[in-house]
């Protein structure tokens, strides 16, 4: 950066080189050039000469004043006009930064994705700080009182092998930068309660021609967790509202869920699972698109209306469960 140049003088910033965005700041330049009594001192920001708010303090020093400085980063340098020199002489340079102190980290969440071998902790960092902000994740065993600290700039993956202090832990996050430090509330976790099953994936769909054609969605997960609860949401791509089917699942075999869908319509499906009774869900699976065949079922409209959903479709499943409506919108 510009701070690596050879200086013939000194440049400094008040209140500091890293300061709160929107502050008024002063940049001082003091020349110390052999055989030079500077006629004039010039300031440059990002290579562009500044014209205003420059005050000469004495023979060797000048001040540049900025009101309400809002740039996250700027490279400053100053030069002197020396007698008998055609060009300006470089005095010194400095990189300056403005930003904000960190917000209190909140929504601290720790999960163990099955087979990952890691506990992944994330949090809401709050507003953008614009300056280098580090986070220290504290993990304290409630059984041994032993505390471990992990330094990161975003989220953290902690090897489950390193969690030797039993199953119960307190987790909290400290955020710090040059402008301040904040600490989150403590999150109490039990390692057995934060496991998210291996991702559920929809593999294919088929429509079976029967008196009333039915669509079978095939889906699976590599999870070894015995008790898993899942949701499958689906809708016609022209509809706004998701329909959600909930069921308990045993992944010792590929799952088959049956749907009675309207003909010649494009549908989208997604699935997600959690260990039954636990807190955290998988993210929704990749979008699975399926278009039903054109054949219209040969039944009376009255028969077709029996037990239909409000979007004109019905659902059954090999797994037990019930159907709910979900207005969460188009979440990918």
């Amino acid at each position: 950066g510009i701070t690596n140049i050879n200086c013939s003088g000194h440049i400094w910033v008040e209140p500091a080189t890293i300061f709160k965005m929107g502050m008024n700041i002063s940049i001082y330049c003091q020349a110390a050039i052999k055989n030079c009594q500077p006629r004039k001192l010039h300031f440059y920001k990002n290579g562009i000469k500044e014209r205003f708010q420059i005050t000469r303090i004495n023979k060797t020093t000048a001040r540049l004043w900025y009101k309400n400085f809002l740039e996250p980063h700027a490279s400053m340098y100053c030069t002197a006009e020396c007698p008998k020199h055609f060009q300006e002489t470089l005095i010194c340079g400095k990189d300056i930064s403005s930003g904000y102190p960190p917000d209190i980290p909140d929504e601290v969440t720790c999960v163990i994705y099955e087979y990952s071998g890691n506990m992944t902790c994330t949090w809401n960092a709050g507003k953008l700080t614009y300056i280098d902000t580090k986070y220290v994740v504290h993990v304290k065993s409630l059984e041994t009182e032993e505390e471990q600290q992990y330094l990161t700039s975003s989220y953290i993956n902690i090897s489950t092998d390193s969690l030797q202090g039993g199953k119960k832990y307190l987790v909290w996050v400290q955020a710090a930068n040059a402008l301040g430090m904040e600490e989150s509330k403590q999150l109490q976790i039990h390692l057995d309660d934060i496991v998210i099953p291996s991702a559920a994936v929809i593999s294919r769909a088929e429509t079976i021609n029967a008196t009333v054609p039915k669509t079978i969605i095939y889906w699976d997960s590599q999870t070894t967790i015995e008790k898993v609860s899942c949701e499958m949401r689906y809708k016609a791509t022209t509809n706004q509202t998701w329909n959600v089917k909930e069921f308990d699942t045993n992944f010792t075999y590929v799952q088959q869920s049956e749907f009675y869908l309207e003909p010649n319509i494009k549908y989208v499906f997604q699935v997600r699972c959690q260990e039954t009774g636990k807190r955290y869900w998988q993210p929704w699976s990749s979008l699975f698109f399926h278009k039903t065949p054109e054949t219209v079922p040969q039944v009376t409209s009255k028969a077709f209306q029996h037990d239909t959903w409000n979007s004109g479709l019905t659902v059954a499943s090999i797994s037990t469960g019930h159907l709910t409506s979900d207005n969460r919108g188009d979440i990918g």
Partner: antibody, heavy 120, light 111 residues
Framework: DVQLQESGPGLVAPSQSLSITCTVS????????VHWVRQPPGKGLEWLGM???????DYNSALKSRLSINKDNSKSQVFLKMNSLQTDDTAMYYC??????????????WGQGTTVTVSS | DIVMTQSPASLALSLGQRATISCRAS??????????MHWYQQKPGQPPKLLIY???NLESGVPARFSGSGSRTDFTLTIDPVEADDAAIYYC?????????FGAGTKLEMK
């Protein structure tokens, strides 16, 4: 190794019908959709239609009345039939696959194409 | 049907320059948090090749010189820096709605 291979008649007389077969390997037609795209000499790509894994079809609005797409999953073959051909149907005809159950949701593998010339 | 308008129709660049190709859809091609817009490269005598899927994702094996951006109706394919091997015709395609539609293509030539 994923492959698609088009085979067609090469030359078709005006007002006659065109039949092209796309034979695929390395993936299942029950899980992937297959699209047909054509390209007249020196011109751009034109989407003709598709057959979903389920067997359902979608067609280019302007060609819908002349087109039909079918498939035989067990033989790994997809069939394009186009009726009432005219000279402006002369083109390179391609088949391509799309997976609609995850990324990329795009035509990631294409056949080399088969040339169809409509002429008397 | 969604109409895809590509610009420019052609451009000639020197090696090392940046190529920017634009594609505008007549209506949004976004749904479920994705932009169903893809970019293909076609060289003479060859079928098209997928470069970018879902607006900004680089297909496996495609050089990092290629990048895609945009959402809803306005999309851009960027090649930076351009190499001799990039001389080809580039097409955008949407499959948010059936019927799928392609842009008319942009021919990239080397000066």
């Amino acid at each position: 190794d994923v492959q698609l291979q088009e085979s067609g008649p090469g030359l078709v007389a005006p007002s006659q019908s065109l039949s092209i077969t796309c034979t695929v390997s390395g993936f299942s037609l029950s899980r992937y959709s297959v699209h047909w795209v054509r390209q007249p000499p020196g011109k751009g790509l034109e989407w003709l239609g598709m057959i979903w894994g389920s067997g359902s079809t979608d067609y280019n609005s302007a060609l819908k009345s002349r087109l039909s797409i079918n498939k035989d999953n067990s033989k790994s073959q997809v069939f394009l039939k186009m009726n009432s051909l005219q000279t402006d149907d002369t083109a390179m005809y391609y088949c391509a696959r799309v997976y609609y159950g995850g990324s990329p949701y795009a035509m990631d593998y294409w056949g080399q194409g088969t040339t169809v010339t409509v002429s008397s | 049907d969604i109409v895809m308008t590509q610009s420019p129709a052609s451009l000639a660049l020197s090696l090392g320059q940046r190529a920017t190709i634009s594609c505008r859809a007549s209506e949004s091609v976004d749904s479920y948090g994705n932009s169903f817009m893809h970019w293909y490269q076609q060289k003479p005598g060859q079928p098209p090749k997928l470069l970018i899927y879902l607006a900004s994702n680089l297909e496996s094996g495609v050089p990092a010189r290629f990048s895609g951006s945009g959402s809803r109706t306005d999309f851009t394919l960027t090649i930076d820096p351009v190499e001799a091997d990039d001389a080809a015709i580039y097409y955008c395609q949407q499959n948010n709605e059936e019927p799928n539609t392609f842009g008319a293509g942009t021919k990239l030539e080397m000066k």
